[in-house]
Interface confidence: low
Amino acid sequence: KIDECKRGDVTVKPSRVILLGSTVNISCSLKPRQGCSPYSRRNKLILYKFDRRINFHHGHSLNAQVTGLPLGTTLFVCKLACINSDEIQICGAEILVGEQPQNLSCIQKGEQGTVACTWERGQDTHLYTEYTLQLSGPKNLTWQKQCKDHYCDYLDFGINLTPESPESNFTAKVTAVNSLGSSSSFPSTFTFLDIVRPLPPWDIRIKFQKASSVSRCTLYWRDEGLVLLNRLRYRPSNSRHWNMVNVTEARGRHDLLDLKPFTEYEFQISSKLHLYKGSWSDWSETLRAQTPEEEPTGMLDVWYMKRHIDYSRQQISLFWKNLSVSEARGKILHYQVTLQELTGGKVMTQNITGHTSWTTVISRTGNWAVAVSAANSKGNSLPTRINIMNLCEAGLLAPHQVSANSESMDSILVTWQPPRKDLSAVQEYVVEWRQLHPGDDTQIPLNWLRSPPYNVSALISENIKPYTCYEIRVYALSEDQGGCSSILGNSEHKAPLSGPHINAITEEKGSILISWNSIPVQEQMGCLLHYRIYWKERDSNSQPQLCEIPYRVSQNSHPINSLQPRVTYVLWMTALTAAGESSQGNEREFCLQGKAN
């Protein structure tokens, strides 16, 4: 290490801190009895500049004169070389060449501000240093400010440059003075326009007008008097990307024509005095404002379901999807549903608030049409019109070979083949899905998507949960009729968690009827494909017999006629999904009382 100079010393003259261009004398001397041998000529002293040899001498001391040292720190190390041994470090020294102040820059904040300059001090010499900042202007005017703080790198002249002669040149220079001497920065020359940085615009306001069907707004602000250029930036509050506009001689106002309705925007403005001189002001404070609503665009995606009630009545359930934010263009206050009997011409209009569905009961006779539109404070969207028809009535239009395959945890790929006939009549397909739910299904949400007539597959992912069975329908729709096919499908699935619970076994004319309770929906773990009924003689070690029944939603009983009379059997059931078989349900014993053949 440099500071462990046990064997000798390194001295530097005139000083270890020097001015750029100065010459230094470096000497290295051994302490008594620290050489290779008493004979001085066997002691070879070597001087290194960093890792490069620059001098050597046989004896107890070495002297070297060094010039041309660069700015910053240079390390010199003296080593002793003895015959047949490694070089031994004697001592070393760091020589610092002081840097002149650099990167002087000056700025005046605003037309009424004062000139202040900053600079880089350079590497610290640890010498007491005074800084003098000098500004000279036209007509031999000079201003001077001094700073006796060793760490000084900023001074404010306290003077205000005025625009009377904007092309007049000013020159600033900073000089550092310490015990070594003085060193000045390169001078910085500038004009009023170069260094005045305007204050950011203030008092920003926005005014909205209605011009044709586009929201036009005017942005107003106040600026300092000499500002020539402005740049505006604006964005929706939930966006990270700014739109930028440059304007010349705006005089505190600018029209914006491309704002989206019913959107909160952020606006900021910056100013500059000259096209190519000077610097931009800081951005102004942010103005936040919401653009006004405009009437909705786009049309609602509407679907419906029909349900037979009795010989004269049917229930129609309408469903529609929310408009996107860009289509709604405001807060949707209500949906307007119009129901019309085409033959009698009667019209019923109803405003629906807070729902995206509507159910009504209508006559089974007559032709009916519905129209649904969305309304905000400025108006209504174009209505979506649908003629109510029997969606599954046209067998020739039914898609065939419908399949549903798990694509991921939360999506199902539905594929189908076009109708065998009337292929050209198909205008679109609608794929509809809802959770399979035994019993009342009127409260179960309905999902759908539309697909063009050339598609024969659709990936459904909205409201798809794993381990859940969905009833999926594919409709082929023409101008005035529809055909449909249905299938059960699930995404991720497992074997059911439990088997059906046998709740009763009854005897009927020599066979038995087994009744069971459905497996709870949350334990089915997907679409059930089959039930299995197992039976074997009690106390027998033989393999059980089994009967496999295809799963049907409403079925919960099944006959078996292969049991022997007066033999006690044990019976149980399991359920299967495509992923496997459940564990067995409860066991029941039964003995058929009928006569033996």
Partner: antibody, heavy 117, light 106 residues
């Protein structure tokens, strides 16, 4: 799941500045509006303002002159500074996550700050 | 500045329907949210965007908003629903809370 936790001194002297930090854990601070809301003892809720993850802010006009909200996305934290406090600023201070449609779906547990000499 | 007005208190018998109103100028044109707060706890969102219910909030809570009034309806009120209820809306870039309503289940 995402959780919010307020931290800061429970006692502040009058005329000093109240400083609180809210740490968001279990999720990112990105793409939400983060707010400070207070509730004086036995009274209702008062909103201070929000900060978006980009640093843009919006303040309640009645408190704007005394309030600063800042965000440090690298630490998943945002902070409240309320200057020149008086006894009337004694309250439970909550941090909350807001959506673009201005409801608060996630709240911190709240921290009681008392202003007293 | 915009104000939302709520009744200070509402009482209801268990199993009955409770309605808490919140009124403000043209409130129907703004999105209303509702929170309940039990003693010593943070507020909890129960209705947002006038009618929507966050997951985990029972179906007995519903909301509506039109004209100058937003209404929180609790059907089949239970003892656990006793709390302070606050409405909230957004006006001129400011979040505004109602003064709160104490719901008492008798």
């Amino acid at each position: 799941q995402v959780q919010l936790q307020e931290s800061g001194p429970g006692l502040v002297k009058p005329s000093e500045t109240l400083s609180l930090t809210c740490t968001v854990s279990g999720g990112s601070i990105s793409s939400y509006y983060w707010s400070w809301i207070r509730q004086p003892p036995g009274k209702g809720l008062e909103w201070f303002g929000y900060i978006y993850d980009s640093g843009s802010t919006n303040y309640n006009p009645s408190l704007k002159s005394r309030v600063t909200i800042s965000v440090d996305t690298s630490k998943n934290q945002f902070s409240l500074k309320l200057s020149s406090v008086t006894a009337a600023d004694t309250a439970v201070y909550y941090c909350a996550r807001g959506s673009y449609f201005w409801y608060f779906d996630l709240w911190g547990r709240g921290t009681l700050v008392t202003v007293s000499s | 500045s915009y104000e939302l007005t709520q009744p200070p208190s509402v009482s209801v018998s268990p199993g009955q329907t409770a309605s808490i109103t919140c009124s403000g100028d043209k409130l129907g044109a703004k999105y209303a949210s509702w929170y309940h707060q039990k003693p010593g706890q943070s507020p909890v969102l129960v209705i947002y965007q006038d009618t929507k219910r966050p997951s985990g909030i029972p179906e007995r809570f519903s909301g509506s908003n039109s004209g100058n009034t937003a209404t929180l309806t609790i059907s089949g009120t239970q003892a656990m629903d006793e709390a302070d209820y606050y409405c909230q809306a957004w006006d001129s870039s400011t979040v505004v809370f109602g003064g709160g309503t104490k719901l008492t289940v008798l």
